[in-house]
């Protein structure tokens, strides 16, 4: 006969399990936070910077007292599958003036999918719903020049900095109610 | 320079409410959240909440939900909170304080606002 | 919520001194490399004034005798030789989990 049976397999703690997920996010908050301020010191930005393909962000004045988890993480991962795409279109369509934030650049695209893959994995354990495969996103065009991919760049990490954020006040908020 | 200026001291009866205000100025007023800090006599230093002034987005300890509001004129680059259904536990100074994104310590403070609840 | 314990309350201690005082968390706040736990100093009458952030990290226009230390529940902050300015009420203040909460604090004063 083989060997006995291990112990069944706990079932996780969704106050474990939201922790890991914060101290990824808030790490990455500061990776952003940092990039950012280099970005800021090569191209200083004159005013604010959008761009029309990003996520609107998801906390508004009331939001943040009627958040579920389910809508949180759904929510979540959806933005930042957009900043991932974005990341990545950084780093292809940029330019060379943004050749000087690698290997930065590169390192937050890694720790965005890996934050993406941890939200994916607490969704899976919490046995919440799993979103619908992402309709195929239309591509982005190239920045017209090399200021426009400056902006565009100073618009993605700001714009990742502040989801993120939401994202640690949303998740901590969540779980002082578990 | 870095600085966050807060409105005067005040004195209010019991059941009434108060609203402080705190200006930003040196820096990007929606790069960081806007805390709010109360000092009682004898008490240790008590967070009330936050707010997001890019979004407006507030949170609270629980122990001040449904008591204090906390909002923001981006355009005048101030931040307000607002106590109601005052008692007299809640005599004590208020400081405004910068917290960075998603860390909460806070590296620059108001000068306090005195509030005095008394019949 | 998390508590924070200082101690000792009060310490007299003479300019030219070294300064540990500590602060005890209910649980760990700390996880893989962070430890969220903040120092101030506050004077009569005066706001607080960050010294130390994230455990171990000098606020901008600190002076360097002041440092911080420790992981999981136990904290000191240290300063190395006191200066006449250095005397006043310090707190530490943890940023774990919502809400974040603050020591009862300690005052150093002059022997």
């Known amino acids: 006969p083989g060997p006995p049976p291990g112990p069944p397999r706990a079932s996780p703690d969704p106050r474990a399990e939201l922790d890991s997920t914060v101290l990824l996010t808030r790490s990455l908050l500061a990776d952003t936070r940092q990039l950012a301020a280099q970005l800021r010191d090569k191209f200083p930005a004159d005013g604010d910077h959008n761009l029309d393909s990003l996520p609107t962000l998801a906390m508004s004045a009331g939001a943040l007292g009627a958040l579920q988890l389910p809508g949180v993480l759904t929510r979540l991962r959806a933005d930042l599958l957009s900043y991932l795409r974005h990341v990545q279109w950084l780093r292809r369509a940029g330019g060379s003036s943004l050749k000087t934030l690698e290997p930065e650049l590169g390192t937050l695209q890694a720790r965005l999918d890996r934050l993406l893959r941890r939200l994916q994995l607490l969704m899976s354990r919490l046995a919440l719903p799993q979103p619908p495969p992402d309709p195929p996103a239309p591509p982005l065009a190239p920045p017209s020049s090399a200021w426009g991919g400056i902006r565009a760049a100073h618009a993605i990490l700001g714009g990742l900095h502040l989801t993120l954020d939401w994202a640690v006040r949303g998740l901590l908020l969540l779980k002082t109610r578990l | 320079e870095v600085q966050l200026v807060q409105s005067g001291a005040e004195v209010k009866k019991p059941g009434a409410s108060v609203k402080i205000s705190c200006k930003a100025s040196g820096y990007t007023f929606t790069d960081y959240n806007m805390d709010w800090v109360k000092q009682a006599p004898g008490q240790r230093l008590e967070w009330i909440g936050d707010?997001?002034?890019?979004?407006?987005?507030?949170i609270y300890n629980q122990k001040f939900t449904g008591r204090a509001t906390l909002t923001v004129d981006k355009s005048a680059s101030t931040a307000y909170m607002e106590l109601s259904s005052l008692r007299s536990e809640d005599t004590a100074v208020y400081y405004c304080a910068r917290g960075e994104l998603g860390h909460w310590y806070f590296d620059v403070w108001g000068q306090g606002t005195t509030v005095t609840v008394s019949s | 919520d998390i508590v924070l314990t200082q101690s000792p309350a009060s310490l007299a201690l003479s300019p030219g001194e070294r300064a540990t005082l500590s602060c005890r968390a209910s649980k760990s706040v700390s996880t893989s490399g962070y430890s969220y736990i903040h120092w101030y100093q506050q004077k009569p009458g005066q706001a607080p004034r960050l010294l130390i952030y994230l455990a171990s990290n000098l606020e901008s226009g600190v002076p360097a005798r002041f440092s911080g230390s420790g992981s999981g529940t136990d904290f000191t902050l240290t300063i190395s030789s006191l200066e006449e300015e250095d005397f006043a009420t310090y707190y530490c203040?943890?940023?774990?989990?919502?809400?974040?909460?603050f020591g009862q604090g300690t005052k150093l004063e002059i022997k």
């Open positions: 203040q943890h940023s774990r989990d919502l809400p974040p909460t």
């Open positions: 707010i997001n002034p890019h979004s407006g987005g507030p």
